[in-house]
Interface confidence: medium
């Protein structure tokens, strides 16, 4: 049924109002059922087929063939102690386009996500001869001329105005009903910009001959990578080991990753050099650095850059 109290429609198209106690109306066939219109100076004028050749009345439905500008106003359905009211606003058709801007439904679709447009009109289904789907007012090549459908993974090129135009005959006249969607394709909003946790520069106090574990943690997407860079050539120092990366999924569906660089039997060559941890994604990279400092020298380092 037509439950929305405020309705905007375009002139020249078939249109209907269906009251919401339809099943009840069938049960009480003998009950008087009336449709009224009020607009401006005219208060509660009862509608009947003699009111206009464009109006058709059924038990549950008031049909317009088609609706015109002067149909703007308030409509009432009355049956016993049940009343339903609608405010109808009929707007001008855009003569220079295949659709009217004020009658557009906007949809946002993420790129690579499933994107579907199906041209259906359940109420007029039996009267529809054919249906065409247009993109930016140009007809698309779709085989099914009863219910044209687009089903695909969205690409940025899919952005545009899609208009389903249903062509139907009634009493020897040809009518069309247009439903337009403004499809906007956006970047995959589910992807985050990966970030390394903690300070960008970390001084770590160590003792020669001992071991240290440098922990690099990041919040990232599933396909992002986290890695260590150190020395002239990674892997040239047999005392340096990259431990297996640990990943835990967050409640939001992102990943918390942790990768440890283990330095055993720390020597002079390990001091005052940069051990860089990087997280890389399609959106860019983030890097944090660790510098090993001899415990005896730690007094020279400001407290706020010191990390245990």
């Amino acid at each position: 049924c037509t439950s929305r109290p405020h309705i905007t429609v375009v002139e020249g198209e078939p249109f209907y109002l269906k009251h919401c106690s339809c099943s009840l109306a069938h049960e009480i066939e003998t009950t008087t059922k009336s449709w009224y219109k009020s607009s401006g100076s005219q208060e509660h004028v009862e509608l009947n087929p003699r009111s206009s050749s464009r109006i058709a009345l059924h038990d549950c439905v008031l049909e317009f063939w088609p609706v015109e500008l002067n149909d703007t106003g308030s409509y009432f359905f009355q049956m016993k102690n049940y009343t339903q009211k609608w405010k109808l606003n009929v707007i001008r058709r855009n003569k220079h386009s295949c659709f009217t801007e004020r009658q557009v439904t906007s949809k946002i679709v993420e790129v690579k996500k499933f994107f579907q447009i199906t041209c259906e009109n359940s109420y007029y289904q039996t009267l529809v001869n054919s249906t065409s789907l247009y993109k930016n007012c140009k007809k698309l090549l779709l085989e099914n001329n009863k219910n044209p459908t687009i089903k695909k993974n969205a690409e940025f090129e899919d952005q545009g105005y899609y208009s389903c135009v249903h062509f139907l005959h009634h009493n020897g006249k040809l009518f069309n009903i247009t439903k337009t969607f403004n499809i906007t394709i956006v970047e995959d909003r589910s992807n985050i910009v990966p970030v390394l946790l903690g300070p960008k520069l970390n001084h770590v106090a160590v003792e020669l001959g001992k071991n240290v574990r440098l922990n690099c943690s990041a919040l990232l997407n599933e396909e992002d990578v986290i890695y260590w860079m150190f020395g002239e050539e990674n892997g040239s120092d047999p005392n340096i080991h990259e431990e297996k990366e640990m990943r835990i999924m967050t409640p939001e569906g992102k990943w918390h990753a942790s990768k440890v660089l283990r330095i055993e039997n720390i020597g002079e060559s390990n001091l005052n050099v940069l051990y860089n941890c990087t997280v890389a994604s399609t959106g860019g990279t983030d890097t944090k650095s660790f510098i090993l400092v001899r415990k005896a020298d730690m007094a020279d380092i400001p407290g706020h850059v010191f990390t245990r």
């Epitope: 993109k135 090549l141 085989e143 687009i150």
Partner: antibody, heavy 118, light 107 residues
Framework: EVQLLESGGGLVQPGGSLRLSCAAS????????MSWVRQAPGKGLEWVSA????????YYADSVKGRFTISRDNSKNTLYLQMNSLRAEDTAVYYC???????????WGQGTTVTVSS | QPVLTQPPSVSVSPGQTASITCSGD??????ASWYQQKPGQSPVLVIY???NRPSGIPERFSGSNSGDTATLTISGTQARDEADYYC??????????FGGGTKVTVL
Amino acid sequence: EVQLLESGGGLVQPGGSLRLSCAASGFTFSSYAMSWVRQAPGKGLEWVSAISGSGGGTYYADSVKGRFTISRDNSKNTLYLQMNSLRAEDTAVYYCARIRGDYRTDIWGQGTTVTVSS
Amino acid sequence: QPVLTQPPSVSVSPGQTASITCSGDKLGDKYASWYQQKPGQSPVLVIYQDSNRPSGIPERFSGSNSGDTATLTISGTQARDEADYYCQAWTHSLSTLFGGGTKVTVL
């Protein structure tokens, strides 16, 4: 890999017949409309014929109407062009191409050469 | 039979912009596509739906279509862009039409 491979070209006398085939692979053949496009030596592209994915709709250029028949066998992933009453002006490289619903003729075969000469 | 008219040739210096036009009655009401064809090769789609670029086609290729004219623009033309270019318009349903082709020469 998405691929189209034409075959069946050759030398034929005027008034003769030839059947071109186009074998498709790497995609769901029945979901796509297909077309034949030709190119005479040293000339531009000329659309010849097209067929809907189901085979229910066929379309022809005026120059070949009544002489050429486009068809497809979706079970064999193959497109055909039956060419009858061939004329010298039908001499060309014939390409088969895939048409997508959003007006992308995105995949073309390598072409097969048809020569009509006595 | 409707006709699509293209200039036979367009010359352009490397790094400059080449514009190829395609004219036809109310062409802007139809979807236009553009193809690049190099000698001995099959055509390659460079623009579809007037202005959309298939993946793998460089950003220097762009298209527009309004009124009676569709235009293919190649910005910062490179030597490898030297080829024949064909416009295509979809007349109705699966029927289509090609322009006569334009030979782009990079000087």
